[in-house]
């Protein structure tokens, strides 16, 4: 039961995280005009990964896309790439994890396959989350650098009579959405990886406890160990008895008696 819960929760957390990464990537408020030096501005500037916007005194907001690829800063391109990679990996991870969910039955898919898919999606979510966090952090670092550069310019370039206020930019809402979303995706991925350990058919005989009740019908073979012991050389859980006893896979197909692992 705990495995299913962990896997399901990991999936939901990752889903929310990836939705957040997509939202952050599409948002226009990656950087917003710093109003500290000019709190009375009637023209408010903010920028995203794909376009920059200006909200004017009429309440009208005009946005213009960056219609150039080569003319954009390399850092911005890198952030775009990281966010897109994060979204793509996350989307693939979601697709894989849907089929890996223990509560969803697809044909006669073995638990080992589900475990592998859970691990794969978990790793994808972790990388996706890291990409988003990295992308947002790179952009934030870029903002901090530019902020202090423009602050320096503001106080050194004031030789003339005309007062001009240089626009400085600070962290926009998208950065916080991106950090939180990346973190959630990362956590979801870790949860999926943890769930994978519980799903994987372990190479111990703890499942043999299911044979306690059928002790009377067990036929012993020379040199064999009693199936109910769970110890000894039978590490592969091979069938060492006759008389209607079931294989590991057959046992596993029954209602989840061992979900507590």
């Amino acid at each position: 039961m705990a495995v299913t819960a962990c896997q399901g929760l990991g999936f939901v957390v990752s889903l929310i995280g990836i939705a957040g990464i997509i939202a952050a990537t599409c948002m226009d408020q990656w950087s917003t005009q710093d109003l500290y030096n000019n709190p009375v501005t009637a023209v408010f500037n903010y920028q995203g990964l794909w376009r920059s916007c200006v909200r004017e005194s009429s309440g009208f907001t005009e946005c213009r896309g960056y219609f150039t690829l080569l003319g954009l800063p390399a850092m911005l391109q890198a952030v775009r790439a990281l966010m897109i990679v994060g979204i793509v990996l996350g989307a693939i991870g979601l697709l894989v994890s849907i089929f890996a969910l223990k509560c969803i039955r697809i044909g006669s898919m073995e638990d080992s396959a589900k475990a592998n898919m859970t691990l794969t999606s978990g790793i994808m979510f972790i990388v996706s989350g890291l990409c988003a966090i990295a992308g947002v952090s790179v952009f934030a670092n870029m903002l901090v650098t530019n902020f202090w550069m423009s602050t320096a310019n503001m106080y050194t370039g004031m030789g003339g009579m005309v007062q001009t206020v240089q626009t400085r930019y600070t962290f926009g809402a998208a950065l916080f959405v991106g950090w939180v979303a990346g973190g959630l995706t990362l956590i979801g991925g870790v949860m999926m990886c943890i769930a994978c350990r519980g799903l994987a058919p372990e190479e111990t005989n703890y499942k043999a406890v299911s044979y306690h009740a059928s002790g009377h019908s067990v036929a012993y073979k020379p040199g064999g160990f009693k199936a109910s012991t769970g110890f000894g050389s039978n590490t592969k859980n091979k069938k060492i008895y006759d008389g209607g006893a079931r294989t590991e896979d057959e046992v596993q197909s029954y209602p989840s008696k061992h979900d507590y692992v």
Epitope: N38, N45, S58, F60, T167
Partner: antibody, heavy 115, light 113 residues
Framework: QVQLQQSGPQLVRPGASVKISCKAS????????MHWVKQRPGQGLEWIGL????????RLNQKFKDKATLTVDKSSSTAYMRLSSPTSEDSAVYYC????????WGQGTLVTVSS | DIQMIQSPSSLTVTAGEKVTMSCKSS????????????LTWYQQKPGQPPKLLIY???TRESGVPDRFTGSGSGTDFTLTISSVQTEDLAVYYC?????????FGAGTKLEIK
């Protein structure tokens, strides 16, 4: 096209508050902020303040902070300006203006403060 | 507050003449976000509300005759009427649309001989 219809002229006693209305039509009322402008007879234009009809957030010129109160009624697409404790200095034509670049202006409301 | 200084305060010209009026702001009205100057020109005829002529310092509003031209950047702006018509008799105001409180110049009164 943008149309702003203002209430008629008002004669008020000093100290008695007055409320001017401005009904908007021809555009989405909540899209653009509503500005109010004062013009004393034979004088220039003076910006009073603005209100965002979508959330009723206001920004007032400090000079009119204790004088003007801006409100909106979204259901009727109407903006209001209330002038408190008017004096002869408040006798003027008051305009509401909206849309991008204040493209649309009301016809003006003449407020006369007289005892 | 940004001060808007208009000159001259009044002009008397004959129809067909070219007219230039100036507007200076105490601070730059150039927005670095989109490289636009947030200065607007209005025309107010007697007994009427102001009418938008020019925005972004040089962009003519649709329907405004092309004899009206706005120019300038930063703090110095100009409105030019290439060939004055009798219907241009009005007061012309420049407005700071960049910083609160939005401020208007005192106006330039255009009179026709």
């Amino acid at each position: 096209q943008v149309q702003l219809q203002q209430s008629g002229p008002q004669l008020v006693r000093p100290g008695a508050s007055v409320k001017i209305s401005c009904k908007a039509s021809g555009y989405s009322f909540t899209t653009y902020w509503m500005h109010w402008v004062k013009q004393r007879p034979g004088q220039g234009l003076e910006w009073i303040g603005l209100i965002d009809p979508s959330d009723s957030e206001t920004r007032l010129n400090q000079k009119f902070k204790d004088k003007a109160t801006l409100t909106v009624d979204k259901s009727s697409s109407t903006a209001y300006m209330r002038l408190s404790s008017p004096t002869s200095e408040d006798s003027a034509v008051y305009y509401c203006a909206s849309n991008r670049w204040l493209l649309g202006w009301g016809q003006g409301t003449l407020v006369t403060v007289s005892s | 507050d940004i001060q808007m200084i208009q000159s001259p305060s009044s002009l008397t010209v004959t129809a067909g003449e070219k007219v230039t009026m100036s507007c200076k702001s105490s601070q730059s009205l150039l927005n670095s976000g989109n490289q636009k100057n947030y200065l607007t020109w209005y025309q107010q005829k007697p007994g009427q509300p102001p009418k938008l002529l020019i925005y972004w310092a040089s962009t003519r509003e649709s329907g405004v005759p092309d004899r009206f031209t706005g120019s300038g950047s930063g703090t110095d702006f100009t409105l030019t009427i290439s060939s004055v018509q009798t219907e241009d008799l009005a007061v012309y105001y420049c407005q700071n649309d960049y910083s609160y409180p939005l401020t208007f110049g005192a106006g330039t009164k255009l009179e026709i001989k």
